[in-house]
Structures are given as C-alpha cells and as structure tokens.
C-alpha cells in the first residue's frame, strides 16, 4: 500500500523567498505513480494544484499563476519536491501531496494524501531558538495511589511557529498511544502547548516518551522527552530522614535547550 | 463549473448516536462523478473514509456507511456509532477516474464539515482533582466529570501567569481537564474545581505520606544516591544541549 | 509617514480610457497586496480589483472584469489600475487602498485594508 | 459569490449609548476574512477591526467586534460624538469578489 509522509509539518518564509516543499513516497514505486499536490487556504476548499506523472510529465491546474509552482520528483530518494517562488501572502496554506493507490480487492482505486505542510509567511527571520522548551510533570503519589493509575504531562514553551505534533510511546514501542492535549496558545511572540498521557498502574514501571515535531527542532528531527519509570510501592519515611526535601535536595531533571 | 456544497458547516454529535452528513452537487450531475469522503483530524492528517463502489479506508467499514442519493444529486455518509475518535472536519470529493472518455483523476473537494463530539446525556459523576509540580509549572489535572461545565482554581498569592484549561472528552465518555499555571510558590498551590454547584479540593484527594521516593531508576543508569533509598533519578532527553530543572513530586 | 497619493482621475466619455495611478511612500511597498476599491455617487464600496505583492494573483469584480487591468511596479512603489471600455456605472471615486501585511502574529494572515488613498473621481459621461 | 447584508440600514442613537451592528453573510467563512470600516462624508474609509475581532492600529477600545461563520457584530460600547458614520463590513471569503455589505448609517438621535 502507498504511504505519504510530509516530513515538514510546517515551513516558515519571508516575503519573497523560495518555499521547497517535500513528499516522500513508500510503498509504491515513485516513478511508476503519478503525485499530485493540493493546497489548502484557510477557509477555502481544498484545491488541485499541480502534478507529476509516472513518466515525468507535469499538469498545472488552470488559473493557477504560471511560474509560482514548480514540481518534480527524485527516484533515487522516492520524493517528489514541490517549489514555490517568490511566496506572498495570498500562498499561505497547507500543501498536501497525494497519489492513487490501487486497493487489493478488483483493481479499485483510491487517493490517499500526505500529512500536509503549513506554509507560513512571516515579516521577520527569527534568530533567537524557537524551539520547543519542554518541562516534564510526572503522576501526582495522590493519582497513582487512588486510582491505579497516572498521568504524564509534557509542556512544550516558547516555540515558533505554532503548528507542532506531539505523541506518545512507550520506551521500546512503536505504537501510538492514546493521549490528549490542549490547544496551541499564543504567549507574547511564541506559542505554548501541553499534552498529557494516562496510563494503568501496570505501565506506570516503563519509561514513556513524549514526541515532539516542530520545525524548528534541533537538526529537524523529532525531540523526544523521556519520561522516567514510577514507582508505585511509595516508602513513609520520617521528615528528619536525609531524603527530606529542601532548597538543594530537589529530584534534578535534566531537560533539553536546543539552542546553538 | 461543479460545486460540492456540504448540507451543514458543524454537526454536533453525541457518542454512540448515529449521525449523517450530506454533501449536494450544484452544476452536474451526481451520477457522473465518484465520490469520495476524507476525514481532516487536528494534525491536518486527511484520512480516506469511502469511495463510491462500497471502498473504505482501513478501520472505516464497520463504523461508516457511504451512499449516493441520485434523485436528490447528493452523497451521504453516516457515521453509525460516534466515538471522540470521529472527531473531525469531513470532506466530500468528486472525481471520473476510470469512467472512460474525458476524464479527471484530479480530485474536486466542497468544503468542510466540523464534526464535534459530545458524550451522550448521563449521570452527573463529580471530578477528581490533583495537582503536579515542576519548579514554578503547575498543573491541575481534573478527571472524569460530566457534564462539562467546570470552572478551576488554583490557589496562590504568588501567581506569575495562568493559561485556559483544557477540557477534553476522555475515553470513557466523560470529561477530562487540565488547567496550568506559573507561581513563585508552587509548592503551597493548592487547585479547588467548582462543579455542579459543588466544590471540590485537590487536597481531599492527597495520600498521607512523608515519601519523597516516587520515582524508580533504573540500577545502573543515570542514579546518585545520597542515602538509603532516595534516589535522584535524571529524565534524558535525545538532544545535545542540557539544562537542569527541579523536579517536585 | 505611511501614505498613498492618487492621480489619473477625471471627465472621460463611454467607450473611453483612463489610467490610474497610487504613489506609495513610507513603507516597503514590495511587501503589501493592493486594492482598488470604487463609491458611485450616494452608493456603497464596491471591491474593484486586488493584486498581490510580487503580482502572481490578480483578481477583478465580475462588473470590470475584461475591461480593468490592475498592475504594480514595486520599484517605483507604483499602483496602476488600466480602465478602457468605460460606462456610466463605472463613474465613482476610486481609492486605492493597501491590504494588511505582518500584524502583531508576525504571521502574514489577516486581511482588511488599512491604509487609503485620498480617492479620485472618475466621470464618465457623453 | 458571497452577499453581505448589514442591519439595520439605519441606526439612531444618543452619544453615550451602546450601538450593535450586525453583519451577515450568505454563506460561511474564515473569521480572518472579515473586516469592518468606518467612513464619514468626503472622506476615505478607515479600517476599525480585521479578523473580524482584532483593533486595527490607533483605534480605540470602545470599538469590538466578534462572531464567526456567517453573523458579525460591531459594538461601540460607549457612543462619541465622533462615532456617528457609515459602517461597512467587508469578506475576503474563499474567492472573488471581495465584497461589502450595503452599509449601516450610525446618527444622532
């Protein structure tokens, strides 16, 4: 089955400059498949944009402004690149790639799409990291005492732009697990966003990582924030005991600052 | 040129009660296109649903129903049990591809249609409340409430910035909250939840205990051990750079 | 001080031409999408026409359309808006206006028009 | 295209009152595309709100606007003898035409 995978989830432009967009293929051999882009508008349909067929040749949907888009496709790495120029305001949109697959059952056909990049068009470079800034929240002893069970918080600061994908897994898994989060929150010039996972008591003994995608992530790739294994047996100690708390004798936690 | 018109931009659904979503064609007719439903969900992830000709995407068949009323020049789909999974914006989509002659393997989409979802009517079921620290980071965790309107408090004289909560359907149909805060003293923060004219304390919830042990290390790995079994345990983090924060459990 | 001055109006009989022209000053001009925008005597704003920064997307109102050509010359911080085929509709003013561009989001996505043109009368009468 | 219709065409008011202005579209939009605007005789309209909710620069607070979809509102909390005007409202929706509503007059009573 073909698979699509945007691996920029968004790409921030100054007016002016060239966006290069990038859809990766699997599953299906590049050069034997035609891709297509679209693009969404905030507030508009999704429309067809442009395509690349199997043997190379490109269709530009009419209407769509000649030499704004440029498409093409490498083999050698299954990828098709879609190239805006000279990006203004009216491109701002999320591009998604797309192709027909043919399903198992009598040659029937359907069009699955990639998982979309948001073009953003900002007035400024930003210097400063931008980054997601993570601060971890392990299960409160209350939570893990009287329900059979915990909650991990991952509070991500202080990134730009605002599109971000968090999700969970365990330590030496690869499935997903189901999470929940608030909304992306503007704070002065950055953004602000918190997921949280609820696990059984017996998971709270694995290690959990909170995976983070962001475009501004350090070498572009996924930040992964390891959350350390609970344990649930809690000991009563007496308060005059050396493990009692005080300005020096925090639980230190070491977090990530990806800043150059 | 043809024009795909959803019946309604929002549908509320409740979970477990069958909904429909219809989309008219204005221009054409229905019968000489394909249609198709995508599901958009909050990652911008489209997710193919149905294509005429009884298609489904993986997991779509046994929860989704397709169908073409051709008198009417519209496409139905209905979603027979709503889960909070279902949540979306759902896109009807037309193409000819395979129908011979002049044909277009392009797809052709109307707009939107926001599917929201709501638990279904229940028993009022009143919150737990507990309360996580990270230096000056608070976070107040409200779990399984119903019905949905709550307001949440958290207690400080020190307050340096709070955020709006976020209230979310959990997976058993009810709801779930999370409220966070900065403050000078985190530590003395205390969250109070008022729900269905009730109040409720995170302390009414607190274990009685001295223990600051909560977290398990591994034996080898990232440990210092000052005394007994109190253990300082470092949470790692695949990236270069590294700054430490206090943990407060 | 950010301001857009209007020239090219006047008397022009149906059937005849006029060319309109909006200097912009104080601000990166190449930045900014540019409107036209009409009032007919005792009326309404109509939206007339609309160009973006670097000139890729051009859009008309269905009543100009094929006879309005709107055009920019960002190096002379330039708005243009071509009127042939004239009719007695078509007498208004005609304000050329700029559209929003970077607000306090740093993110260009918002849309009105935030600064005018003083406005010029087009009359077009036999 | 999308119509845009404003109520009510007329709205006569003493300074100091509260003046709601009600725009309503033919069918939905983002609430980025919508902006509303002030003119006064011989003079060029000014730009009051964009996004349908944020003050555009200089303006002052007793002027808000909210909604989403297809209703829109302008509220002027307190009515200054300066406030008494046209008001437009206009949506950038999905395509061309750009278009405005008809206009609400706002006079003194």
């Known amino acids: 089955a073909g698979h699509l995978e945007q691996p920029q989830i968004s790409s921030t432009k100054t007016l002016s400059k060239t966006a290069r967009l990038e859809c990766v293929v699997s599953g299906i051999t590049i050069s034997a498949t035609s891709v297509y882009w679209y693009r969404e508008r905030p507030g508009e349909v999704i429309q067809f944009l442009v395509s690349i067929s199997y043997d190379g040749t490109v269709r530009k949907e009419s209407g769509i402004p000649s030499g704004k888009f440029e498409v093409d496709r490498i083999p050698e790495t299954s990828t098709s690149t879609l190239t805006i120029h000279n990006v203004e305001k009216q491109d701002i949109a999320t591009y998604y790639c797309a192709l027909w697959e043919a399903q198992q059952e009598l040659g029937k056909k359907i069009k699955v799409f990639g998982p979309g990049t948001k073009l953003i068009i900002t007035d400024k470079q930003l210097d400063a990291d931008v980054s997601p800034k993570p601060t971890i929240f392990l299960p409160s002893i209350a939570e893990t005492k009287l329900q059979k069970a915990g909650t991990y918080l991952c509070l991500l600061e202080k990134f730009f732009p605002d599109v971000i994908k968090i999700h969970w897994q365990e330590k030496k898994s690869n499935t997903i697990l189901g999470s929940q989060e608030g909304n992306t929150m503007k704070t002065n010039d950055t953004y602000m966003k918190f997921s949280w996972l609820t696990v059984p008591e017996k998971s709270l003994d694995k290690e959990h990582r909170c995976i983070v995608r962001h475009e501004n992530n350090k070498n572009g790739v996924d930040q992964e924030i390891i959350f350390p294994p609970i344990k649930t047996d809690v000991i009563t100690m007496d308060p005059k005991d050396n493990c009692s708390k005080d300005a020096n004798d925090t639980l230190l936690l070491q977090l990530t600052n990806t800043s150059a | 040129a043809i024009e795909l018109v959803p019946e309604h931009q929002t549908v509320p659904v409740s979970i477990g009660v069958p909904a429909t979503l219809r989309c008219s064609m204005k221009g054409e007719a229905i019968g000489n296109y394909y249609i198709n439903w995508y599901r958009k969900t909050q990652g911008n992830t489209m997710t193919f649903i149905y294509r005429e000709k009884d298609i489904y995407g993986p997991g779509f068949k046994d929860n989704f129903q397709g169908d073409i009323d051709i008198a009417k020049n519209l496409a139905v789909l209905k979603i027979l049990a709503p889960s909070e999974r279902d949540e979306g914006s759902y896109y009807c989509a037309c193409d000819t591809l395979g129908m011979g002659g002049e044909y277009t393997d392009k797809l052709i989409f109307g707009k939107g249609t926001r599917v929201t979802v709501e638990p279904r009517s229940q028993p009022h079921t009143k919150p737990s409340v507990f309360v996580m620290k990270n230096g000056t980071n608070v976070a107040c965790l409200v779990k399984e409430f119903y019905p949905k309107d709550i307001r949440i408090n958290l207690v400080s004289s020190k307050k340096i910035t709070e955020f709006d909560p976020a209230i979310v359907i959990s997976p058993s149909g009810k709801y779930n909250a999370v409220k966070l805060g900065k403050y000078e003293d985190s530590n003395s923060v205390t969250c109070s939840v008022q729900h269905d004219n009730k109040t409720v304390h995170s302390t009414d919830f607190e274990v009685k205990t001295d223990s600051t042990d909560h977290v398990k290390p591994k034996e080898t790995e990232n440990t210092k051990q000052p005394s007994k079994s109190c253990h300082k345990p470092k949470a790692i983090v695949h990236t270069e750079k590294v700054n430490m924060m206090s943990l407060t459990v | 001080e950010v301001q857009l001055v209007q020239s090219g109006g006047g008397l022009v009989k149906p059937g005849g031409s006029l060319r309109l022209s909006c200097a912009a000053s104080?601000?990166?001009?190449?930045?900014?999408?540019m409107n036209w925008v009409r009032q007919a005597p005792g009326k309404g704003l109509e939206w007339v026409s609309s160009?973006?920064?670097?000139?890729?997307?051009?859009y008309y109102a269905d009543s100009v359309k094929g006879r309005f050509t709107i055009s920019r010359d960002n190096a002379r911080n330039s708005l243009f808006l071509q009127m042939s085929s004239l009719r007695a509709e078509d007498t208004a003013v005609y304000y050329c206006?700029?559209?929003?561009?970077?607000?306090?989001?740093?993110?260009?996505?918002?849309?009105?028009?935030?600064?005018w043109g003083q406005g010029t009368t087009v009359t077009v009468s036999s | 295209e999308i119509v845009m219709t404003q109520s009510p065409g007329t709205l006569s008011l003493s300074p100091g009152e509260r003046a709601t202005l009600s725009c309503r579209a033919s069918?939905?939009?983002?609430?980025?595309?919508l902006a509303w605007y002030q003119q006064k005789p011989g003079q060029a309209p000014r730009l009051l709100i964009y996004?349908?909710?944020s003050r555009a620069t200089g303006i002052p607070d007793r002027f808000s606007g909210s909604g989403s979809g297809t209703d829109f509102t302008l509220t002027i909390s307190r009515l200054e003898p300066e406030d008494f005007a046209l008001y437009y409202c206009?949506?950038?929706?999905?395509?061309?035409?750009?278009?405005f509503g008809q206009g609400t007059k706002v006079e003194i009573k």
């Open positions: 206006a700029r559209e929003i561009g970077v607000t306090g989001t740093t993110y260009y996505q918002d849309y009105g028009m935030d600064v």
């Open positions: 104080g601000f990166t001009f190449s930045n900014y999408d």
């Open positions: 160009i973006s920064s670097s000139s890729s997307y051009i």
């Open positions: 069918q939905s939009f983002s609430s980025n595309y």
């Open positions: 996004g349908a909710s």
């Open positions: 206009q949506q950038y929706g999905s395509s061309p035409p750009f278009t």
